[in-house]
Interface confidence: medium
């Protein structure tokens, strides 16, 4: 019962759901399910039967390995997939794959919330805007990463002449993609170009 594999893939890609071990020899039947009650395909030692489902036409079963190929996965395909095998001995076994489909992150837009010249220092507040996604943020000043504690959607920092950077980059990433947005300043403390 303890077979649970997590997979994260990018939307639009083709995915292979398979198990890391060999299938039981000469099994009698193999079924792939989507969530609990949606049969995708069933193989019963003679032929594969594909069920009416949202996967019809974009899945293929390899009875040899038990692998299920799904083309052009979308976020709606997020779920736990279950492969159930009936062995010749009568025992049954199952494997579960929790599939997470993520969209590639969009290119972020950097908004200058505040930029203020303060006695040779530059107070800077930048926000990195992308439409409602759960992502990680990394800020760079002239390609050098800012400390970890400053890594969220807003960068707020006071720059002194000795650590003044010209360009600021926000990198947004999820587990399948990453994109950058950059703004550059003209010394001492004005927006140059985006």
């Amino acid at each position: 019962q303890g077979h649970l594999v997590h997979m994260t893939v990018v939307s639009g890609s083709n995915v292979t759901l398979n198990i890391s071990e060999s299938l039981p020899e000469n099994y009698k039947q193999l079924t792939w399910f989507y969530t609990f009650d949606q049969k995708i395909v069933e193989w019963d030692s003679r032929k594969s039967k594909y069920f009416e489902s949202k996967f019809k036409g974009r899945v293929r079963l390899d009875p040899q390995s038990g692998a299920l190929y799904i083309s052009k996965v979308q976020k709606e395909d997020n779920s736990t997939y279950i492969m159930r095998v009936l062995k010749k001995t009568g025992n049954e076994q199952e494997w579960k794959i929790k599939l997470q489909v993520l969209d590639p992150v969009p290119k972020p837009v950097i908004k200058i919330e505040k930029i203020e010249d303060m006695d040779d220092n530059c107070y800077l507040k930048l926000s990195c805007v992308i439409p409602g996604e759960s992502v990680n943020y990394t800020w760079y000043g002239d390609k050098r990463p800012f400390p970890k504690e400053l890594q969220n959607s807003v960068l707020e920092t006071t720059l002194m002449p000795h650590n003044y950077s010209r360009c600021y980059t926000c990198q947004v990433s999820n587990s399948v993609s990453s994109k950058n947005g950059t703004v550059c300043l003209s010394p001492p403390c004005t927006l140059a170009r985006s």
Epitope: D37, K39, S79, T80, L86, E92
Partner: antibody
Framework: QVQLVQSGAEVKKPGASVKVSCKAS????????IHWVRQAPGQGLEWMGI????????RYAQKFQGRISMTWDTSTSTVFMELSSLKSEDTAVYYC??????????WGRGTPVTVSS | DIQMTQSPSSVSASVGDRVTITCRAS??????LAWYQQKPGKAPNLLIF???SLQSGVPSRFSGSGSGTDFTLTISSLQPEDFGTYYC?????????FGQGTKVEIN
């Protein structure tokens, strides 16, 4: 040894709700399924629904759709089944069962629920 | 939904008798069938899964057979402790459905 421990007997008035708990002792629910099955006095077994605490998926029998809810607290390995708008026909023993997706190899002792005005 | 029909609804037999209970599914369920025994006031207990596989700890006098739509539970030599109600259940798909039960009484 793994056990499913259920909450105690309940007496409810028609229209009320009941919430029955099922705690796994000697085991956590991660990667397992819990089903709820009920049995009215002198009657057979009736499947109500299933929950997978690992990913939040639930399925309910059509008959109970709209008045049943299965939730869980993974930190205490407890699953809850709440049935609302109770009627006298809901008088039954409610069992949690499962740990196997395809059949029920482990059962709680059952929680008697009486619905009476 | 898949309908499960059990017969007989009750059977009375003597110790040592061979007892057979049948279960019919309204559609092909391959070998996806389980059998349970329930004693009064107790939760059901799994006897057989995948139509013919004996659950560990269950005496070998219990056996299951069948596939497709017709299934059988056999108690080869009835013992006094085998009284109770026996249920079949299809495990092919949701919703899970049970037969109406067969009550086994000892003469």
């Amino acid at each position: 040894q793994v056990q499913l421990v259920q909450s105690g007997a309940e007496v409810k008035k028609p229209g009320a709700s009941v919430k029955v708990s099922c705690k796994a002792s000697g085991h956590t629910f991660t990667n397992y399924y819990i089903h709820w099955v009920r049995q009215a006095p002198g009657q057979g077994l009736e499947w109500m629904g299933i929950t997978n605490p690992n990913d939040g998926n639930t399925r309910y029998a059509q008959k109970f759709q709209g008045r049943i809810s299965m939730t869980w607290d993974t930190s205490t390995s407890t699953v809850f089944m709440e049935l609302s708008s109770l009627k006298s026909e809901d008088t039954a023993v409610y069992y949690c069962a499962g740990l196997r997706y395809w059949f029920f190899d482990l059962w709680g002792r059952g929680t008697p629920v009486t619905v009476s005005s | 939904d898949i309908q499960m029909t059990q017969s007989p609804s009750s059977v009375s037999a003597s110790v040592g008798d061979r007892v057979t209970i049948t279960c019919r599914a309204s559609q092909d369920i391959s070998s996806w069938l389980a059998w349970y025994q329930q004693k009064p006031g107790k939760a059901p207990n799994l006897l057989i899964f995948a139509a013919s596989s004996l659950q560990s700890g269950v005496p070998s006098r219990f056996s299951g057979s069948g596939s497709g739509t017709d299934f059988t539970l056999t108690i080869s030599s009835l013992q006094p402790e085998d009284f109770g109600t026996y249920y079949c259940q299809q495990t092919d798909n949701f919703p899970r459905t049970f037969g109406q039960g067969t009550k086994v009484e000892i003469n």
